[in-house]
């Protein structure tokens, strides 16, 4: 018996087609992805093949103005239109709190939404009961397939799930649910979830009875043969893991942003054992037509976005200096504003020992593309912020050793004075440079804000200590020459859309007046 699994993950509100790098589509003849194009390909495959499941491994939420405006209603609407069969909860599904998940998505989705390792407690337990499930048994042709969901146990540090959801260890939580499916005589089981490729592989290895793992979170691109675009494969598709009980378990993921549609064909024997698996992600490039009816619906929903981008988010009573003459040479108040917003967006009161789990922010000055003049009645709009942060990036959470951070700050000024983009703006960091010293030895003082303290204060950076830092995904990926971050980071979790982080902060503060306050000094 053959099953076709079509899968997406980490779509991050790319409902419209995008450029090849998943930013805003500029030249339509070169654009990719989007739900209208995805629908065309899904329909084609459904027409051709008998037993097809369309699955999403989480993080539909967060990433473009679509999410900012529609807050998840767009996800439910278009996933319903595409007739998804199931979705796993990702960490970003909690970005607007549990209510922001329940109302727009859980209550509106016409497909099951899954996670076996999220347990509700207290008053939330009855409110959310039945709105998401640990697993779902789906009829597919003449057979049944069990889908069991999982979500990153790090979600409380990455999003806003509140205090009434407990995120258990994935493997511990999955095993009893898979066992339950086995007692229900379900012999074909897919683990669908959002914990990253390393955890996906562990699930394949450790959870008895899981036949296939469909993952997300790490934006992993797997491919067999010559890859069709810029993404470099992390391994073959499917990636085969030998389980502890000797089975060959295919593990798949389909990069991110709706650029690819994962296509996996599995052949099962009559006892539900995987006999063979093959496939590849399908690049959704512009040679695949956008479905006219879905496209028309997208255009209808778009109207509200255009209106939103000119509405006032808040006011500034000071000039927001985002000029390259400032932000690439010295501390600039636009950099301070953005870093403060980045930290504010990551406030998670973890326990009594820590006032927060992260206190530090770094931001390449070259990523700040425009100032905002306060003399326009102080008004700040999404449109204004899009000029400051035009690249559609994310502000991510990483873990780095102190020694890596020191290298990053040396890189920040290694060729100072040439108006290059690597000059770092900061938050929760005090740095002093001596430019008379040779490149690679210019950081004379580097103090960082404590997190394990009731009254935050600045302490010298410790080389061997591991620190959490919020930074643009551009830097996490080694951009602007920050190869040491890419090479030495110990953990990387993708965060929220950059403009959304700053716009939310400004809306929350209502009136802003960021200053230049001595975060960056020259001796």
């Amino acid at each position: 018996w053959e099953l076709t699994i079509l899968h997406t993950n980490d779509v991050h509100s790319r409902l419209e087609q995008t450029s090849e790098d998943s930013s805003k589509c500029v030249n339509a003849s070169r654009c990719m992805g989007g739900v209208a194009r995805l629908f065309t390909k899904v329909q084609q495959i459904r027409r051709a093949e008998p037993n097809v499941l369309l699955l999403d491994a989480g993080d539909q939420y967060q990433g473009t103005i679509w999410f900012t405006v529609y807050k998840g209603a767009e996800v439910a609407h278009f996933m319903n239109a595409l007739r998804y069969d199931a979705m796993a909860l990702g960490n970003h599904e909690f970005d607007n709190g549990v209510e922001g998940l329940i109302e727009p998505l859980l209550k509106e989705a016409k497909f099951p939404i899954l996670s076996a390792n999220i347990k509700a407690k207290g008053p939330l337990a009855s409110q959310i009961s039945g709105l998401y499930l640990p697993y779902k048994v789906l009829p597919v042709g003449d057979e049944v397939v069990g889908i069991v969901g999982y979500t990153s146990k790090e979600t409380p540090f990455l999003s806003n799930p509140g205090t009434n959801l407990v995120f258990e260890d994935e493997i511990t939580a999955l095993q009893p649910e898979v066992d339950k499916l086995k007692t229900l005589n379900v012999n074909k089981i897919i683990a669908l979830g959002h914990s990253g490729f390393e955890t996906d592989k562990l699930i394949a290895q450790k959870v008895r009875g899981v036949d296939v793992v469909v993952g997300g979170h790490s934006n992993t691109f797997l491919y067999t043969g010559n890859p069709p675009s810029k993404e470099v494969p992390a391994g073959k598709y499917p990636f085969i893991v030998t389980s502890d009980d000797g089975r060959k378990v295919p593990v798949v993921q389909a990069y991110a942003f709706g650029k690819y549609l994962g296509y996996l064909k599995i052949e099962f024997d009559e006892r539900g054992n995987v006999i063979s698996s093959h496939g590849n992600p399908i690049l959704l490039n512009s040679s695949i037509p956008e479905d006219p009816s879905i496209k028309a619906d997208i255009n209808k929903w778009r109207i509200k976005l255009d209106n939103y981008s000119t509405q006032e988010l808040g006011k500034t009573i000071v000039y927001l200096d985002g000029s390259s003459q400032s932000c690439r040479f010295r501390e600039c108040n636009m950099g301070n504003l953005i870093c403060d917003a980045m930290i504010n967006n990551n406030l998670r009161h973890a326990d009594e020992m820590f006032w927060n789990h992260v206190s530090m922010c770094i931001l390449n000055g070259g990523g700040i593309r425009s100032p905002i003049d306060e003399r326009n009645n102080g008004t700040i709009t999404w449109e204004n912020l899009a000029a400051v942060l035009p690249f559609g990036g994310t502000f991510d959470l990483v873990q780095l050793k102190g020694s890596t951070l020191k290298k990053a700050f040396e890189h920040s000024v290694h060729r100072y004075g040439q108006s290059t983009g690597e000059f770092l703006q900061v938050g929760g960091i005090h740095v002093v440079y001596d430019l008379s010293r040779k490149p690679g030895d210019r950081v004379v003082k580097l103090d960082v804000l404590c997190t394990k303290c009731r009254v935050p204060s600045y302490d010298p950076l410790k080389m061997d200590e591991i620190y959490k830092v919020i930074l643009p995904n551009f830097l996490a990926n080694g951009g602007d020459g920050f190869q040491m971050i890419k090479d030495e980071l110990l953990r990387h979790d993708s965060g929220d859309q950059d403009i959304n982080v700053v716009s939310t902060y400004i809306s929350k503060m209502k009136v802003i007046y960021p200053a230049v306050e001595g975060r960056i000094k020259f001796s």
Partner: antibody, heavy 121, light 107 residues
Framework: EVQLVQSGAEVKKPGESLKISCKGS????????LSWVRQMPGKGLEWMGE????????YYNEKFKGQVTISADKSISTAYLQWSSLKASDTAMYYC??????????????WGAGTTVTVSS | DIVMTQSPDSLAVSLGERATINCKAS??????VAWYQQKPGQPPKLLIY???YRYSGVPDRFSGSGSGTDFTLTISSLQAEDVAVYYC?????????FGGGTKLEIK
């Protein structure tokens, strides 16, 4: 090398049955769709229907539904077009054509050389 | 059914000159249009798929454009071997329908 090899020309009488074939080679037969296209003498092209050999799913142009049957035998990588009762108006060239539904070439990328069917009393 | 109206029915163009063939769909077919060349006694050959993508091995003098309902096949510099009948086809909805064909000759 991808090839679609069609069976030879046929001369039939009205009311007779006929089954013509199209054998695919040089590719995974079950991973593509196969269509049948009719071209009447001196006329244009008409899509009759298609089969996806992997699933056996068939789709017909309403105009040809009930007039012809499309089938496939994946064990020998061959698709068929058959009539139970031919008419003089079935006289035409019949092409099979391949469709890559997993790829992005929206069109028929390989065609057979065609089978001429002549129906005459 | 979606009707594909091709124009002109026939076209005579001098060698080295540009030839343009148009195709109009009776409803929006996005970019799901292919163009074929058929020479006497031969099966059709795919030239352009998805409205504007040249199929592998097709000379770059052939190009396609359009989306929605209006599509064009252009031969930038006509060669003697381009004499043939050209068909457009929509691949958006079944039944997949072809245009009536354009017979291209040398002037």
């Amino acid at each position: 090398e991808v090839q679609l090899v069609q069976s030879g020309a046929e001369v039939k009488k009205p009311g007779e049955s006929l089954k013509i074939s199209c054998k695919g080679s040089g590719y995974t037969f079950t991973s593509y769709g196969l269509s049948w296209v009719r071209q009447m003498p001196g006329k244009g092209l008409e899509w009759m229907g298609e089969i996806y050999p992997g699933s056996g799913n068939t789709y017909y142009n309403e105009k040809f539904k009930g007039q012809v049957t499309i089938s496939a035998d994946k064990s020998i990588s061959t698709a068929y077009l058959q009539w139970s009762s031919l008419k003089a108006s079935d006289t035409a060239m019949y092409y099979c054509a391949r469709y890559d539904y997993l790829g992005s070439s929206y069109g028929f990328d390989y065609w057979g050389a065609g089978t001429t069917v002549t129906v005459s009393s | 059914d979606i009707v594909m109206t091709q124009s002109p029915d026939s076209l005579a163009v001098s060698l080295g000159e540009r030839a343009t063939i148009n195709c109009k769909a009776s409803q929006d077919v996005s970019t799901a249009v292919a163009w074929y060349q058929q020479k006497p006694g031969q099966p059709p050959k795919l030239l352009i798929y998805s409205a504007s993508y040249r199929y592998s091995g097709v000379p770059d003098r052939f190009s396609g454009s359009g989306s929605g309902t209006d599509f064009t096949l252009t031969i930038s510099s006509l060669q003697a071997e381009d004499v043939a009948v050209y068909y457009c086809q929509q691949h958006y909805n079944t039944p997949y329908t072809f245009g009536g064909g354009t017979k291209l000759e040398i002037k």
